[in-house]
């Protein structure tokens, strides 16, 4: 049975040009966590695999970093990265854990992080 | 340029370990790298069997879990796979791969060696 | 585990001619896709990774797209060197599995 819940930093905006840190944490579970996806609709952004460390895809790589912890952080923001995240926790035994995180870009400088909440 | 080589007994008989050598030279398994085993059966299907990471942690595929084991030796830049408990089910050509976390993809590739398990 | 289904095990073409490959998986793997081409008497060798990106050295006359499920790698003129077996191989969980493979034969 599946009794984890994975916390994210929710609905989140950042200005244009700047950077953000996406931050999943999960909880209430003793499974082993394999590997963290990271993913922007239908396009992979990085993968932390426990043994390997991080991979960042080639798409990514001028603008991902990774960290911290099992987060990422994303560069050089533009409008065009409003959108969901998600980040998708391979664990064993339990499965899969997906966390999803809105990130909206904004011109001006009025951006401020969202309230955390949880998704079972 | 990284060079990879496996070695070990052609012919195993059932109910016995499989034990297969890869080689690597050119680049040290403690660099960087997934240092993989995966194996082709006859039909031309490939299983990837699991890998023992740079750092040595080692990683199954499940199917496999109860019967697998690699292993590495650092000073001579070698890793290993035991196989128990083989049946006719387990001949195939056995592969050594390295994975990069650059590509995560299987960039350089033994030439295999066939195994025939049969008494 | 994640099956990837190659739907044509054989597939006749000519030289010069554009030739298709699909691979289905059966659960979202995003675009944590890579190809591998394997000649007779041969290893697999790397020719795409990231669903679409060319491994150093080949040529780009190999083409790889699709995300999600569904992954297309083409050829866009098939040379007499190219015959062998393709497969399609997802990372984007543990266990990495492979696809059946297709042959590419000469008509």
């Known amino acids: 049975m599946m009794t984890g819940t994975i916390e994210t930093t929710g609905n989140i905006s950042a200005e244009k040009g700047g950077s953000i840190i996406l931050q999943c944490h999960l909880s209430s579970t003793t499974a082993q966590v394999t590997q963290v996806n990271w993913e922007q609709q239908d396009q992979l952004l990085a993968i932390c695999n426990a043994d390997l460390g991080w991979h960042i895809s080639p798409s990514f790589k001028d603008r991902v970093a990774p960290g911290p912890g099992l987060g990422l952080t994303l560069q050089s923001l533009t409008v065009n990265d409003t959108g969901e995240y998600f980040c998708i926790y391979h664990t064993y035994p339990d499965g899969t854990y997906t966390g999803r995180i809105f990130l909206e870009v904004l011109e001006s400088s009025v951006a401020e992080h969202g309230a955390r909440f949880q998704i079972p | 340029d990284v060079q990879l080589q496996e070695s070990g007994p052609g012919l195993v008989k059932p109910s016995q370990s499989l034990s297969l050598t890869c080689t690597v030279t050119g680049y040290s398994i403690t660099s960087d790298y997934a240092w993989n085993w995966i194996r082709q059966f006859p039909g031309n299907r490939l299983e990837w069997m699991g890998y023992i990471s740079y750092s040595g942690a080692p990683r199954y595929n499940p199917s496999l879990k109860s019967r697998i084991s690699i292993t590495r030796d650092t000073s001579k830049n070698q890793f290993f796979l035991q196989l128990s408990f083989v049946t006719t089910e387990d001949t195939a050509t056995y592969y050594c791969a390295s994975l990069g976390t650059d590509y995560y993809a299987m960039d350089y590739w033994g030439q295999g060696t066939s195994v025939i398990v049969s008494s | 585990d994640i099956v990837m289904t190659q739907s044509h095990k054989f597939m006749f073409t000519s030289v010069g001619d554009r030739v298709s490959i699909t691979c289905k998986a059966s659960?979202?793997?995003?675009?944590?896709v890579a190809w591998y081409q394997q000649k007779p008497g041969q290893s697999p060798k790397l020719l795409i990774h990231s669903a679409s990106y060319r491994y150093t050295g080949v040529p780009d006359r190999f083409i790889g797209r699709g995300s999600g499920t569904d992954f297309t790698f083409t050829i866009s003129s098939v040379q007499a060197e190219d015959l062998a077996v393709y497969y399609c191989q997802q990372y984007y969980s543990l266990p990495w599995t492979f696809g059946g493979g297709t042959k590419l034969e000469i008509k």
């Open positions: 659960q979202h793997v995003s675009n944590a």
